[in-house]
């Protein structure tokens, strides 16, 4: 009886099970009762990453420098090229089809997580006792200066954007 289902790495065609082509190869002709599936390796700059019956290989992704992209990992016959962004930029999506400049954290906010090629800067508000007085993609919130350890007193309270101002203690006469 002709099969209705086939084993793993096979496909059903013309009432018979044919072997799929291995990753890195494309289908030239289906199997017959006399011959196995005929497959051919993908060409230069092409790939197929699964067991398949595709008659055409996929083109490797192009990392367009005009979009801020560069090659992170060169493609093979079995894998696509992986793009990433130039320094200071990150991908706009998981597919990394274009890049945008890393976001800076405004004064009053510090960097919680520095941006990577695939993720943007994560900012956090500076909590009480910490400040950031610059717009930066790298700077964390800094702790207020401890006047006491310097044998000084707070002359002006700190904010999330400014450090405390220390001054000499008033001498009792």
């Amino acid at each position: 009886e002709p099969p209705t289902a086939c084993r793993e790495k096979q496909y059903l065609i013309n009432s018979q099970c044919c072997s799929l082509c291995q990753p890195g190869q494309k289908l030239v002709s289906d199997c017959t009762e006399f011959t196995e599936t005929e497959c051919l390796p993908c060409g230069e700059s092409e790939f197929l990453d699964t067991w398949n019956r595709e008659t055409h290989c996929h083109q490797h992704k192009y990392c367009d420098p005009n979009l801020g992209l560069r090659v992170q990992q060169k493609g093979t016959s079995e894998t696509d090229t992986i793009c990433t962004c130039e320094e200071g930029w990150h991908c706009t999506s998981e597919a990394c089809e274009s890049c945008v400049l890393h976001r800076s954290c405004s004064p009053g906010f510090g960097v919680k997580q520095i941006a990577t090629g695939v993720s943007d800067t994560i900012c956090e508000p500076c909590p009480v006792g910490f400040f950031s007085n610059v717009s930066s993609a790298f700077e964390k919130c800094h702790p207020w200066t401890s006047c006491e350890t310097k044998d000084l007193v707070v002359q002006q309270a700190g904010t999330n954007k400014t450090d405390v101002v220390c001054g000499p203690q008033d001498r009792l006469r």
Epitope: V28, S29, C31, T32, E33, F34, T35, E36, E38
Partner: antibody, heavy 117, light 107 residues
């Protein structure tokens, strides 16, 4: 027991035609692809033609394409090879074979075709 | 067309010896290769399919190996009835082709 019995061979003049038959028994004929393979005297094996189990698909090498026709009658459990415009180089023993697991798993005893004037 | 080249053309050995027959394909055929044996005056018979898979009823002394372009048929210890001609055949693509054969003869 699987049996393949060829017939129809003999001496024939160049340019003439001949039809070979292969009577199959011992298996469900209509479930198997079939082929013809030939062997010139003292030489190796050469594939001549194949036909799918249903008879819809036929396959030939370039050197016999257009001169040979493979066919089958599943109701009679018989395989045929029609050979036209015969040449001296067609002289050979012609074997009928069954395709099992993409191999020629059973062979007939062969029938000798001699093309000579 | 895929060309199969068998070597040696003739192998002269004594009963009990090990026989190693080679079949080389002109391009990769994965494991899509069969081996056949033909004794004088007889029809060929299937020995090995898919390069290394044994066939029911064939003695265990016959084994096949290889993949891609290089294949080997090994007869571990020759019996008198093993002296014959051996053919490889590819079924990777049309046209189906056979090697020219290796004759294993008694030394």
């Amino acid at each position: 027991e699987v049996q393949l019995v060829e017939s129809g061979g003999g001496v024939v003049q160049p340019g003439r035609s001949l039809r070979l038959s292969c009577a199959a028994s011992g298996f469900t004929f209509s479930n198997y692809g079939m082929s013809w393979v030939r062997q010139a005297p003292g030489k190796g094996l050469e594939w001549v033609a194949s036909i799918s189990s249903g008879g819809d698909d036929t396959y030939y090498p370039d050197n016999v394409k257009g001169r040979c026709t493979i066919s089958r009658d599943n109701s009679k459990n018989t395989l045929y090879l029609q050979m036209n415009s015969l040449r001296a180089e067609d002289t050979a023993v012609y074997y009928c074979t069954r395709a099992g697991g993409k191999a020629m798993d059973y062979w007939g005893q062969g029938t000798l075709v001699t093309v000579s004037s | 067309e895929i060309v199969l080249t068998q070597s040696p053309a003739t192998l002269s050995l004594s009963p009990g010896e090990r026989a190693t027959l080679s079949c080389r394909a002109s391009q990769s055929i994965r494991d899509n290769l069969h081996w056949y044996q033909q004794k004088p005056g007889q029809s060929p018979r299937l020995l090995i399919n898919y390069a290394s898979q044994s066939i029911s009823g064939i003695p265990a002394r016959f084994s096949g190996s290889g993949s891609g372009t290089d294949f080997t048929l090994t007869i571990s210890s020759l019996e008198p009835e093993d002296f014959a001609v051996y053919y490889c055949q590819q079924f990777n693509s049309w046209p189906l082709t056979f090697g020219q054969g290796t004759k294993v003869e008694i030394k």
